[in-house]
């Protein structure tokens, strides 16, 4: 008959918690990869694509060895919230143009949201300081043209792909230290 009401739950194994977060991150990374392939196939666009509103990549090689769990989770959550906002914006602003990618974009948004909730849960289970609510971000301006929106889609998916690789690397390294 479980613990009495009001008593704290037995804390789960932090390595197992971290492991499940890594796996969810990797499955989101695979979704992102598949969607990027589709985007490149249907809307080819050479060269680098940048979007000033996207977060800058969190990590460099030297810093990876000195990572601390609170800073990784905090930064990852902030960056993924930004990407979630950008994916939502993309779906709204480019609905008709990106219709062929719509089911996958919707799935990506759902999984991104799920990963964010998992990160929040992990932070509370590990008793890490909770962040204050994010201040409302300024609205993203609609793309100037269909082509501008497609370039934005390339930038968003490319940045998300790289951010998720950084996240997996950081979390796996941290897991070995727990």
């Amino acid at each position: 008959p479980g613990p009495p009401p009001g008593s704290p739950r037995a804390s789960p194994d932090p390595r197992a918690e971290l492991d499940s977060t890594v796996l969810l991150t990797r499955s989101l990374l695979e979704d992102t990869r598949q969607l990027t392939i589709q985007l490149k196939d249907k809307f080819p666009a050479d060269g680098d694509h940048n979007l000033d509103s996207l977060p800058t990549l969190a990590m460099s090689a030297g810093a990876l060895g000195a990572l601390q769990l609170p800073s990784v989770l905090t930064r990852l959550r902030a960056d993924l919230l930004s990407y979630l906002r950008h994916v939502q914006w993309l779906r709204r602003a480019m609905g008709s143009s990106l219709k062929t990618l719509e089911p996958e974009l919707g799935t990506l948004q759902t999984r991104l949201d799920r990963l964010l909730r998992r990160l929040q849960l992990l932070m509370s289970r590990l008793a890490l300081p909770q962040l204050p609510p994010d201040p409302p971000a300024p609205p993203l301006a609609p793309p100037s043209s269909t082509w501008g929106g497609i370039r934005a889609a390339h930038a968003i998916l490319g940045g998300l792909h790289l951010t998720l690789d950084w996240a997996v690397r950081g979390l796996l390294l941290l897991k070995t230290r727990l």
Epitope: D19, S20, L23, L24, T25, R26, S27, L29, E30, R33, L57, M59, S60, A61, L64, H161, L162, L164, D165, W166, V168, R169, L172
Partner: antibody, heavy 119, light 111 residues
Amino acid sequence: EVQLVQSGAEVKKPGASVKISCKASGYTFRDYNMDWVKQAPGQRLEWIGDINPTIGAPIYNQKFTGRATLTVDKSASTAYMELSSLRSEDTAVYYCARGELAHWYFDVWGQGTTVTVSS
Amino acid sequence: DIVLTQSPASLALSPGERATLSCRASKSVSTEGYSYIHWYQQKPGQAPRLLIYLASNLESGVPARFSGSGSGTDFTLTISSLEEEDFATYYCQHSRDLPPTFGQGTKLEIK
């Protein structure tokens, strides 16, 4: 054509170091990780580690931590693996391989570099 | 580390026959909708070649006679009708955790 071309065979004495290069062409270097795999005679293939060219951040198999060093030269689209404190068990073919980000499967391989460690 | 065990160690078949190669993992390598098992072919003096990734996805340029299946701990590579060029050693590899590890291989020989 996507290609990985590795440096030539090496013969080294025990205790020495070896540095192998792997030149990538035919794809955007930063879009994939570069992994390194060892194949010793009669042994299983063994993953040494990988590096993300954009971040420059290597991850190592604990078995090779401290002896293997992975680096990249982005401007030359070239990855390097240095193995130090060589011993006879390091005699093997070493492959570089292109890896999907954070998935660790390898869709393009170099031709392999034979390293022989012998006194 | 996860240990992969391949069976049989060697298999002698004739061209045109069906080949079934098995790979068993010491713990589940499937989760969150993906199975982290990949299959490679290697011929003497050559580098391995990716055939199947994430358990069942055929790598670009690989003939459709190759297929992969399975989940959890048991996986299979099937070659529906063997061609002369298919006689080689086949390795499975997992990437569920770090480090990724490989099976010991199955050598497919001409009968």
